[in-house]
Structures are given as structure tokens and as C-alpha cells.
């Protein structure tokens, strides 16, 4: 029965970008400017998102898809579909309730967003610190102290720094 009814429903013929206009004998009318319908058979068009203030337009609203927003320079997107814009900080900083603060000693942030993370503990992998960490960079771990003893072969190159994880958006 449902399938039969949908086949007879004139609104089911209205494609995306239109709405089924009850005021015009269920004719398919184009979505007016600043509105869209992303699926067929809709009885109304949705209002387009406006990218205002700290948001800027990434992609205009078309008749079939909503506008896509981005953040103005100095801010970055957070949340699904860039629902929020968060202030950028410098590398070596993290955003707190009181604004951008330098990373504490022993932590680093190599991005303009996210939190400060602890330096890699080289000794956990049985290695030594080859290059000291900074607020902006993780430490670089090198060969273990035993590998550096006299007579030991030093053909093996130092292991690369562990890839820092990306903070969630």
C-alpha cells in the first residue's frame, strides 16, 4: 500500500532543488533564493546557512545543497560542518579559557590548534634524547646509551621522531 501511494503521490516527482507547492496544485516549484532541498519529494525548502561574522563562505548555497562555511583567518573550524570557529594560537601554545597560553615545560604543540602534549619519553623505548624538545617541537630520540658505547657499531641511523598525533577538530 505504501509503495502504491508513493507512486501516485505527485510530490514524489519533484526533484531535489524544488518543493511540492500545495498552493499551486502540488506543482514542483523551484526553491526560492537562499533556500534548498537536497532530496526529491520535499514539501518545503530549507533555509540556507548564512556564513556571517567569524564564518566565511566556502561554497555558496545552491538549490540542492546548503552553503558550506569556513572560518576567517586566525580561526579554525570545530564540530561537524564547521559549526564553530575557535581562535588559533601560535605553535608552542594552547587555547585556555583565558586565551592563548605557552606550553608548560615538558610539553609541546606544533600546530595552531589543539592542546600541548608531553614530550616523548625516549627512555621508555630504551633510547636516549638526541635533540631536546621545545614548546613547539617534540624531542628527537636517538640510539640507546648502550649503542653509543666504545666499539659498538653505529651504522644504524637514529630512529625518526614519533609522529605527533593530531588533536581532534
Amino acid at each position: 500500500f505504501e509503495r502504491t501511494r508513493s507512486l501516485q503521490d505527485p510530490c514524489s516527482n519533484c526533484p531535489a532543488g524544488t518543493f511540492c507547492d500545495n498552493n499551486r496544485n502540488q506543482i514542483c516549484s523551484p526553491c526560492p533564493p537562499n533556500s534548498f532541498s537536497s532530496a526529491g519529494g520535499q514539501r518545503t525548502c530549507d533555509i540556507c546557512r548564512q556564513c556571517k561574522g567569524v564564518f566565511r563562505t566556502r561554497k555558496e548555497c545552491s538549490s540542492t545543497s546548503n552553503a558550506e562555511c569556513d572560518c576567517t583567518p586566525g580561526f579554525h573550524c570545530l564540530g561537524a560542518g564547521c559549526s564553530m570557529c575557535e581562535q588559533d594560537c601560535k605553535q608552542g601554545q594552547e587555547l585556555t579559557k583565558k586565551g592563548c597560553k605557552d606550553c608548560c615545560f615538558g610539553t609541546f604543540n606544533d600546530q595552531k590548534r589543539g592542546i600541548c602534549r608531553p614530550w616523548t619519553n625516549c627512555s621508555l623505548d630504551g633510547k636516549s634524547v638526541l635533540v631536546n624538545g621545545t614548546k613547539e617541537r617534540d624531542v628527537v630520540c636517538g640510539p640507546s646509551p648502550a649503542d653509543l658505547s666504545p666499539g659498538a657499531s653505529s651504522v644504524t641511523p637514529p630512529a625518526p621522531a614519533r609522529e605527533p598525533g593530531h588533536s581532534p577538530q
Epitope: P15, A16, C61, S62, S63
Partner: antibody
Framework: VEESGGRLVTPGTPLTLTCTVS????????MIWVRQAPGEGLEYIGF?????FTYYASWAKGRFIISRTSTTVDLKMTSLTVADTATYFC????????????WGPGTLVTVSS | DVVMTQTPASVSEPVGGAVTIKCQAS??????LAWYQQKPGQPPKLLIY???TLASGVSSRFKGSGSGTEFTLTISDLECADAATYYC??????????????FGGGTEVVVK
């Protein structure tokens, strides 16, 4: 809206066209470039939107670059050929879209050896 | 690419008559279609966008309709000033920063 910079150039010569506007703020609108070869139809090149993002027709991507200041929009063209001979129009988009509604008179670019 | 096929290429009608121009898209574009009028030596003029929305200052004698792949521009009560070439144009986004904002081939309207 007024275009400038069109002239006679030889193939391969780079050229930059400038669109100067008054009476409205460029960064509140989509600003569009369209061209028309002599006696031919209209061809959409691309636009820079109100957010500063650029979009190009597939044939124009890589060879044309659109940029803007607060009062001008530039169209940088490279590797020009005889087929690029056309009147180049700059236009403002209507109602937050990339449909051109306010057009300049156009500037003629002739590519010939 | 989205191809816009515009018909007829040319049409001639008397003053007071009506003209219908059709535009067919190679794939569904919702209602993202505009119509322009261009006279020799002039830039185009936007008549209709979003398939049926009349642009500012345009006479209500111009009517746009259609959705999906089939669109129509109707000019009623023709005037001598309507003699021009008319173009349809779609708005369609491809991947990345590529667009298919394609124009139709144009229709020359002659008013007798």
C-alpha cells in the same frame, strides 16, 4: 564595474586583467570572470566568492588565477593562445550566488603572432 | 562536464507575439539555472535566476520555469526592444574547486 588591461599580445605572453569596482564592497559578493570570443557565445571562467575562495571552470584551472584586493579583482592569464582572443567581462554575483548580475563593459584581449 | 543544450538557435516572431526558448541540462541541476539577454556590443543582462526568480528591474513579461534537466524561458507580448540573443546558464559544482557554470549556445530572437 570596469575592466582594464586588455591589449594585443603574442602567444605565450602572460597578461593580467583588472576589474575595478565602486559603490559596493568586493568581499561581500561573488566576483566573476566570463569571456566571449568574437561572434561566439559566453564562456564562464571562474569566480572568487565572498569568503575569498576561488573556483574555476575545468578548462581554466591552472592557467587562470583570480585574486582580489578591497577594490579590485585580478585575472592572471598564462600560456595564452590565439583561442584566448575574446572580450573579458567582470561581473558581480546576485544575492550571494555566482550568477552575474552587474557587468562591466568588457575589455578585449587579442592574441596574435 | 554539464552540457547545456539550448533550442532553437534562432526564432522570429511579430511584435505582441510570444517566444519560448528551451534549455536542457545533461544532468539534473535542481533549479540552479539563469537566463540572460545580450544585445550587440553590450554585456549580458541577468533576467532570471534560480529557474524562475525575476532579477531586479526585469519586466514580468519574462517568465522562467522548469527544474531538474528541462527549463523554459517565455517572453510574452514581444516588444522591439526584446530583439537580442538569449543564453541559459547553470550553476553546478564539481569536485574540489572546479565548477560547471556552463552557458547554453544562445538563441537569437528576431522581432518582426
Amino acid at each position: 564595474v570596469e575592466e582594464s588591461g586588455g591589449r594585443l599580445v603574442t602567444p605565450g605572453t602572460p597578461l593580467t586583467l583588472t576589474c575595478t569596482v565602486s559603490g559596493f564592497t568586493i568581499n561581500s559578493y561573488h566576483m566573476i570572470w566570463v569571456r566571449q570570443a568574437p561572434g561566439e557565445g559566453l564562456e564562464y571562467i571562474g569566480f572568487i566568492n565572498d569568503g575569498g575562495f576561488t573556483y574555476y571552470a575545468s578548462w581554466a584551472k591552472g592557467r587562470f588565477i583570480i585574486s582580489r584586493t578591497s577594490t579590485t579583482v585580478d585575472l592572471k592569464m598564462t600560456s595564452l593562445t590565439v583561442a584566448d582572443t575574446a572580450t573579458y567581462f567582470c561581473a558581480r554575483g546576485v544575492d550571494g550566488t555566482s550568477y552575474p548580475d552587474l557587468w562591466g563593459p568588457g575589455t578585449l584581449v587579442t592574441v596574435s603572432s | 562536464d554539464v552540457v547545456m543544450t539550448q533550442t532553437p538557435a534562432s526564432v522570429s516572431e511579430p511584435v505582441g507575439g510570444a517566444v519560448t526558448i528551451k534549455c536542457q541540462a545533461s544532468q539534473s541541476i535542481g533549479s540552479d539555472l539563469a537566463w540572460y539577454q545580450q544585445k550587440p556590443g553590450q554585456p549580458p543582462k541577468l533576467l532570471i535566476y534560480r529557474a524562475s526568480t525575476l532579477a531586479s528591474g526585469v519586466s514580468s513579461r519574462f517568465k522562467g520555469s522548469g527544474s531538474g534537466t528541462e527549463f523554459t524561458l517565455t517572453i510574452s507580448d514581444l516588444e522591439c526592444a526584446d530583439a537580442a540573443t538569449y543564453y541559459c546558464q547553470c550553476i553546478y559544482y564539481g569536485s574540489d574547486d572546479v565548477i560547471y557554470h556552463t552557458f547554453g549556445g544562445g538563441t537569437e530572437v528576431v522581432v518582426k
